[in-house]
Interface confidence: low
């Protein structure tokens, strides 16, 4: 099973129980010798190819438990036949072995008698048969091949013998490793439960962080939802408030400029009139009547009409009315109202925090109580009771094994010694055959007669006969050992080792009422006294092998339902009911009637109806009818063309006066006109489409107000629910994880499965049965081939 997931808990935020490391390996590797064991398994498959007899074994066990067995009963007879049918291959091999055991001593005896009576070979032929050398060669090669086969069998025997010794020596370490793992399981479990409980604080802290930050989490959430509909409107009103201020400033500038222009224009007109009078007076000089001065005077007289100020400057209307209107508009602090609007939004997080203090405290109380509830639930878990009972069992088993291991090691040395003797005996026989062959081949002289043959050749024959003699003497004893070990080893392999690996053995043990006639399921009866509860060896073993927790493996939910006790819905319900009392009242201010009127008044203030063109037209014109500086320089030039005297001097003085008028009167007017131009441009920009703009803002305002009226409560409800879901999500996720961890992860019974594997698969099958089977296979092979060997040797 994977991690439980909760829709509302953050996906990345996963819990993980710290991994428990076990020492004992899951599987046993035989190494290169495994090939030899496989060879034996193939032989056994040939001898015993039938499937594991589940039904037969069940019936057999049921019969075995019966106090008195009636052998005449048909079902007993049928069961016997089934067993015989299943064991046919083994029985056949046993029969052959028994024949070998019975016949070999008899044949040996008769052969011995026969030989003593000089009837069975050993006669010396003077002349060889024609095919004699060929036959001898054939016999020698056959014997050599057979001896090699025997040698391989002996090698198997030695290897098997050595394996038993080395593997049994490893048993102590293997047992210790298993017990260490079982202790780790016992010790780690309380730590795992502690860890699970500790994770509650992590969850609680996360929730507390969100509760403490309710202003930013919930308040911020509400604010984020409202902002897009309100801020743009407030921004527009704010820009309008700025525009009103700019308009006021522009109108004030314009008004003061216009007033200045009125005065400046009057002053300019007055100055120009005065200088014209002076010039006219000067031109009355008698010199003006005399040629060529008269032409100059006439020229000056004609140009006097240009010395006029622009009369339209004084006719530009003031903007008092518009300024009054804007000042009236500014009596309402629109900027302040907008700021209040912003503030009412920005206050949402603080208001949320203030208004939810009690609810938050309530939720915190609930969360703290959930913590103690979980503590109580975990303390009442039956895992500890089972592990305590198991601990006693582990201790007893360990002391039993440590007590009996020396005995096992002692028996092992007897076995090893016995095996060594058997293998050595066979080795001796085969050595005699090899020596016989070697001496025979080396000492052979084709020209020598039987009486004159050499010592080496003769010794070869002796060696062969000694081999034959020893074969007759011991092979039947060896065959007895082979048969016994074969029957035991083959049946254990076929009825325990193979079905254990394929789990068929568990299926037999899981047969209802088999191991105890009162219990349907033995394990549940033994563990919980509830034999109806389906708890099978196969399922428990498989679950343990998969590293599943004890709670889930042993179906402890039947005696203590963690889901019921944790009661996720009740806890989340408690949080939900606290969250339901979370009420937030918001008062979002959006301008109000005063603000609306303010905008409408501004739209009606008249700046959009002003005749800007008339003002702009004047800003492009010269304040006087002519460029006074040019006029003054021209007048000076004309005066210089006159002869020195009063006329020339008075004209020059007037020219200087005109320059002064330009400096003191015209330049300030030009400055004022520039200011007027800028003010008019600002007003023109503001006034352009003002009514439409205000209408649009008011429409947006209505929309925003409607949104607030109709949606604020639903936004608050939605965000509160979302906030609640987040808080609840943390705990749902945590509680689901607890349920998952306790069921699937805590007190993982893997070491139990490993211990069982160690006892059956490793110790019994790999350490004992595999070498035992290899032993009888090797020795059996060697012993069987002693028969053809002795025939060929003779």
């Amino acid at each position: 099973g994977g991690q439980p997931s909760s829709t509302d808990a953050p996906k990345a935020w996963n819990y993980e129980l710290p991994a428990t490391n076990y020492e004992t390996q899951d599987s046993h590797k035989a190494g290169p010798i495994g090939i030899l064991f496989e060879l034996v398994h193939i032989f056994l498959y040939v001898v015993q190819p039938r499937d594991f007899p589940e039904d037969t074994l069940r019936k057999f066990l049921q019969k075995a438990y019966e106090s008195k067995i009636d052998y005449d009963k048909p079902e007993t007879v049928i069961l016997g036949l089934k067993i015989v049918y299943y064991e046919a291959g083994i029985i056949l091999c046993c029969v052959l072995g028994l024949l070998f055991i019975i016949l070999m001593p008899l044949v040996g005896y008769f052969f011995c008698m026969c030989r003593c009576c000089n009837k069975c070979g050993g006669e010396m032929h003077q002349r060889q048969k024609e095919n004699g050398p060929f036959l001898r060669k054939c016999f020698a090669i056959s014997l050599l091949v057979i001896c090699i086969i025997i040698s391989i069998g002996i090698f198997y025997g030695f290897v098997a013998n050595h394996q038993v010794r080395t593997r049994i020596k490893r048993s102590r370490k293997l047992a210790d490793s298993n017990f260490k793992d079982l202790r780790t399981l016992l010790n780690e479990t309380p730590e795992q439960i502690k860890y699970i409980l500790a994770q509650y604080n992590t969850t609680k802290d996360k929730a507390f962080t969100d509760l403490n930050s309710i202003n930013s989490v919930l308040g911020g959430g509400i604010l984020d939802r409202l902002r897009p509909n309100i801020i743009p409107v407030l921004d527009e009103i704010k820009s309008m408030a700025t525009a009103i201020k700019e308009t006021k400033e522009a109108l004030e500038n314009m008004n003061s400029t216009l007033k200045s222009l009125h005065q400046q224009s009057t002053q300019l007109s007055s100055s120009l009139t005065s200088v014209k009078t002076s010039l006219r007076s000067s031109l009355n000089d008698p010199l003006c009547l005399v040629h060529p001065s008269s032409e100059t005077c006439n020229s000056i007289r004609l140009s006097l009409s240009q010395l006029n100020s622009n009369p339209e400057l004084r006719q530009l209307p003031p903007v008092d009315a518009e300024l009054d209107n804007v000042n009236n508009v500014l009596r309402t602090d629109l900027d302040g109202l907008v700021q209040q609007g912003y503030q009412s939004l920005n206050d949402i997080p603080d208001r949320v925090q203030r208004q939810t203090t009690t609810v938050v405290a309530g939720i915190k109380r609930v969360l703290n109580s959930i913590g103690s509830d979980i503590d109580n639930v975990t303390q009442r878990l039956p895992i500890q009771d089972i592990l305590s009972a198991f601990s006693v069992y582990v201790n007893n088993t360990e002391s039993y094994i440590h007590r009996n291991l020396p005995t096992l090691e002692e028996y092992d040395s007897y076995w090893w010694l016995g095996g060594l003797v058997i293998c050595s005996l066979l080795t001796l026989i085969v050595i005699f055959y090899y020596l016989g062959l070697l001496c025979g081949v080396c000492g052979y002289d084709r020209h020598a007669t039987p009486t004159t043959r050499g010592c080496v050749s003769n010794t070869g024959g002796v060696f062969l006969m000694v081999g034959v003699g020893l074969s007759f003497l011991f092979c039947w004893i060896l065959m007895i050992i082979v048969v016994l070990t074969f029957v035991f080893g083959a049946n254990v392999e076929k009825l325990i080792c193979e079905p254990y690996t394929s789990k068929e053995l568990f299926r037999v043990l899981d047969t209802p009422y088999l191991l105890n006639e009162d219990w349907e399921y033995y394990l549940s009866g033994k563990l919980f006294n509830k034999s109806k509860m389906k708890l099978t060896f196969e399922q428990v073993y498989s679950d343990c092998k998969k590293n599943r927790g004890t709670y889930g493996t042993l179906h402890l939910q039947n005696s203590f339902n963690i889901s019921e006790h944790l009661n996720i819905n009740e806890h989340t319900g408690s949080i939900s009911s606290e969250l339901e009392s979370l009420k937030v009242n918001l008062n979002i201010f959006l301008l109000g009637a005063a603000g609306r009127k303010n905008l409408q008044d501004f739209a009606a203030c008249g700046i959009d109806r002003m005749n800007y063109d008339s003002y702009l037209a004047q800003t492009g014109k010269s304040p006087a009818g002519v460029n006074l500086l040019s006029f003054a320089y021209d007048l000076e030039a004309k005066a210089n063309s006159l002869p020195p005297g009063n006329l020339r001097n008075s004209l020059k003085r007037d020219a200087q006066t005109i320059k002064t008028i330009h400096q003191q009167r015209v330049l300030p007017i030009e400055q004022s006109l520039s200011t007027l131009y800028q003010s008019v441009k600002i007003l023109q920009r503001t006034g352009n489409g003002l009514l439409e703009r205000v209408t649009r803002i008011l429409a947006s305002l209505d929309f925003a107000q409607n949104f607030i009226t109709n949606n604020t409560s639903s936004v608050i409800i939605e965000e509160t629910k979302k906030y609640g879901r987040t808080i609840i999500g943390y705990f749902e996720h945590y509680l689901q994880w607890i349920e998952f961890s306790i069921s699937e992860k805590v007190a993982s019974c893997k070491p139990v499965a490993t211990a069982l594997d160690t006892a059956v698969d490793v110790f019994l099958c790999s350490y004992i049965i595999d070498p035992l089977n290899l032993f009888w296979f090797g020795i059996g092979k060697a012993t069987v081939f002693l028969l053809p060997a002795l025939i060929f040797a003779v």
Epitope: Q353, R354, T358, A361, N585, N587, G592
Partner: antibody, heavy 117, light 106 residues
Framework: EVKLVESGPELKKPGETVKISCKAS????????MHWVNQAPGKGLKWMGW????????SYADDFKGRFAFSLETSASTAYLQINNLKNEDTATYFC??????????WGQGTTLTVSS | DIVLTQSPAIMSASPGEKVTISCSAS?????MYWYQQKPGQPPRLLIY???NLESGVPARFSGSGSGTDFTLNIHPVEEEDAATYYC?????????FGAGTKLELK
């Protein structure tokens, strides 16, 4: 039972500093905000600001920005009001109060501060 | 800031009479709260959320109103009710109190 106990009356000279304490009991201190309210002799109540007891963050009313400082000692369930550079017009009774949403439900007995040269 | 105007500033009543204290807000508020303060004591909450009676407060106190106009009624008034009464809003930040109404008993 919820109780807010303030420190005793204070007599100070202008320019000095005073620190008034408010010890809370009977509830989880960090569950409720702490507010400070002042009352000049014969005058009405004036809200000075509040303290977020969860985060320790203070907020001050416009009239009480600058010389006034709120602080807390969570482990002792105590809030503090410190006034620096005392002036004669700081003479008043200072109350601490906890709030429930929009109103003040529990009040301290008040600390009378007299500033006189 | 929202300004709360209480009227009258001082009033006098005889035991058994009905006393009405008004509180007017400069702009609309959703909720109003009323406090009683006796000399040398801190204020005591009487009414919350316009009309809800705080536990331990006698039933002769009641509150009403909406928008900008709110009232506190005491009927029948008793000797022990002589105190200053304050209205308070927290509808708009910052919270503000009324100037207070001093109730004297004849």
């Amino acid at each position: 039972e919820v109780k807010l106990v303030e420190s005793g009356p204070e007599l100070k000279k202008p320019g000095e500093t005073v620190k008034i304490s408010c010890k809370a009991s009977g509830y989880t201190f960090t569950d409720y905000s702490m507010h400070w309210v002042n009352q000049a002799p014969g005058k009405g109540l004036k809200w000075m600001g509040w303290l977020n007891t969860e985060t320790g963050e203070p907020s001050y009313a416009d009239d009480f920005k600058g010389r006034f400082a709120f602080s807390l000692e969570t482990s002792a369930s105590t809030a503090y009001l410190q006034i620096n550079n005392l002036k004669n017009e700081d003479t008043a009774t200072y109350f601490c109060a906890t709030d429930y949403g929009d109103y003040f439900d529990y009040w301290g007995q008040g600390t009378t501060l007299t500033v006189s040269s | 800031d929202i300004v709360l105007t209480q009227s009258p500033a001082i009033m006098s009543a005889s035991p058994g009479e009905k006393v009405t204290i008004s509180c007017s807000a400069s702009s609309s508020v959703s909720y109003m709260y009323w406090y009683q303060q006796k000399p040398g004591q801190p204020p005591r909450l009487l009414i919350y959320l316009v009309s809800n009676l705080e536990s331990g407060v006698p039933a002769r106190f009641s509150g009403s109103g909406s928008g900008t106009d709110f009232t506190l009624n005491i009927h029948p008034v008793e000797e022990e009710d002589a105190a200053t009464y304050y209205c308070q809003q927290y509808h708009s930040y910052p919270p503000t109190f009324g100037a207070g109404t001093k109730l004297e008993l004849k």
